[in-house]
Interface confidence: low
């Protein structure tokens, strides 16, 4: 049956899917607050542009009858369930915001013909890459693999003089949604990361990981894992670690490393943390006071999704173009818009670009320090600290394969 879009005659709506199975365990009222804050900004921007229109959001709540685990892994049907609700209500906005779970997004793409744009705070997996009407506002797995390959190959920095071509990946299946798909992308044999490495082995048991730390016959000195420092400590504890082991801890959506008075615990000295530069303005906004450093990024992605909708609305209305067209549906990419925290750039496939930051623990100050930054938009690494105070020998990252001499 035909669903009418509430998207013309001066009234424009964004449909926001409110799913219990979200990429981050975020209370739905916080998401609602973020959306409402975004709407206020959009209304102001449209008014300033002389566009006298009405902009609203309709929140579509999942009843959780089919699946109620609150876990993205069980979310395949939930997105379709919500789409059915929209279909029954015969009402839809100009844009669909959500879902954030990779399974939901992928399934919606398989089973529906999306003639309207979809914005997601999540959908990290490779299976959601290159979707023509999908925009992702949190770094997808593809961007992570590009960074890792770029960093592995780098050999011309004062602190990294070896190209790497090997890695262990620790993945035990209990990870958060973002980590699950990031590690999935590293594990997949068809991924860019796997393609560029000569050796890669996935460690699935705690004991496997623990054994590698001091195993003289290990095939790589580098271990990639995903999560926060506490997750690493549970796994590693205070065990001894060979001096040429490097642990890359992917923790993109965690601002805690940049907070005042944060001291790196001793078990982080062999670790490089990959995160993103923190935003600042959300720290004081009304809806984010109760958010953890991790959830700030999720709320910001929802807010920016609304601002993106407003930006596209403004662009099309100023040009006198129709909103309910395939052109509009395919336009949410290859652009920069004014986000809540400054400009936000989307690549040719509608995926957000960001500056990733690689941190190390200074042995002098026990503080996290920026080693280098990586601009996902231009696939470029910028060294920041040319003389890092590393734990590794000669303040240089070791080779990924230990030279054991004649056996």
């Amino acid at each position: 049956s035909q669903v009418s879009q509430n998207c013309h005659n001066g009234s424009y709506e964004i449909s926001v899917l409110m799913m219990d199975n979200s990429a981050f365990a975020e209370p739905l009222e916080n998401v609602e607050d973020a959306v409402n804050e975004g709407l206020e900004i959009v209304r102001g921007r449209l008014q300033n542009a002389g566009l006298n229109v009405t902009v609203n959001a309709s929140f579509m709540y999942s009843d959780g009858l089919i699946h109620n685990s609150g876990d993205c892994r069980s979310s395949t049907c939930e997105g379709l369930d919500l789409l059915r609700k929209i279909s029954n209500a015969k009402r839809m906005g100009c844009v669909l915001m959500g879902p954030s779970c990779t399974y939901s997004t992928f399934q919606m793409y398989l089973d529906t013909e999306l003639s309207y744009p979809m914005i997601s705070a999540g959908s990290f997996g490779l299976s959601c890459d290159y979707k023509e009407t999908l925009t992702r506002l949190m770094s997808p797995a593809r961007k992570l693999t590009y960074f890792l390959v770029n960093f592995w190959k780098t050999n011309d920095l004062p602190f990294k003089t070896y190209s790497w071509s090997t890695s262990y990946v620790y993945k035990n299946g209990t990870e958060s949604e973002d980590c699950f798909w990031y590690l999935n992308a590293l594990e997949a044999s068809v991924s860019y990361f796997s393609h560029e490495l000569s050796f890669k082995l996935v460690l699935r048991q705690d004991k496997e990981f623990q054994d590698i730390l001091m195993d003289h016959n290990r095939k790589s000195n580098v271990i990639v894992m995903c999560g926060g420092p506490e997750f690493l400590y549970k796994l590693k504890g205070d065990r001894a670690v060979a001096e040429d082991i490097v642990i890359i801890l992917v923790d993109l959506f965690n601002d805690q490393y940049f907070e005042d008075n944060v001291t790196a615990p001793d078990y982080m000295k062999n670790v490089l943390v990959l995160t993103q530069s923190p935003g600042n303005s959300l720290l004081n906004s009304s809806f984010s006071r109760n958010l953890s450093p991790t959830k700030r990024d999720f709320a910001l992605a929802y807010l920016n999704g609304i601002l993106l909708f407003g930006h596209m609305l403004k662009t099309f209305l100023e040009n006198g173009e129709n909103i309910t067209t395939p052109k509009f549906a395919h336009a949410f990419r290859n652009l920069t818009f004014e986000g809540y925290d400054g400009p936000v750039t989307l690549d040719d496939w509608g995926d957000v670009d960001s500056t990733m930051v690689l941190l190390y623990t200074s042995v002098d100050t026990k503080k996290y320090k920026v080693l280098l930054t990586y601009d996902t938009h231009v696939n470029q690494t910028n060294p920041v600290d040319m003389s890092p105070t590393f734990t590794w020998k000669n303040s240089k990252l070791p080779n990924d394969i230990t030279d054991r001499g004649p056996q």
Epitope: D260, P278, G279, G342, S354, T355, N382, M386
Partner: nanobody, 131 residues
């Protein structure tokens, strides 16, 4: 080798003005955060005014409306115009820079930190506000 050289410090009466300059050389990053950090006697360093490569400027609350940061890219020079100076503005003012930019907001967030962790520093110029 990145070099930052400050000038323009001196003694000035309360309510007076000064203009600090920072000449940068060897700095080739297209994305950066740079600005002015000060250290008063016996106190920690604190961010005063910062500018990111996208032009985003950020000021400490204590100097908003009085200080203005600007840059002349053709001369690779950073400026700090200080008006309505107060006794509490007395400090050594350092020019500082780093090759990081999150659309200006990592730069902005440096303002809130004590002893901001910039990668490059000038030698400092003393500003004394006294009658």
């Amino acid at each position: 080798e990145v070099q930052l050289v400050e000038s323009g410090g001196g003694v000035v009466q309360p309510g007076g003005s000064l203009r600090l300059s920072c000449a940068a050389s060897g700095y080739t990053y297209s994305r950066y955060c740079m600005g002015w950090v000060r250290q008063a006697p016996g106190k920690e360093r604190e961010g005063v005014a910062l500018i990111a490569s996208d032009g985003t400027t950020t000021y400490a609350d204590s100097v908003k409306g009085r200080f203005t940061i600007s840059q002349d890219n053709s001369k690779n020079t950073l400026y700090l115009q200080m008006n309505s100076l107060r006794a509490e503005d007395t400090a050594v003012y350092y020019c500082a820079a780093d090759a990081v930019n999150w659309y200006g907001s990592i730069c902005a967030s440096m303002i809130r930190r004590k002893n901001p962790a910039f990668g490059y520093w000038g030698q400092g110029t003393l500003v004394t506000v006294s009658s």
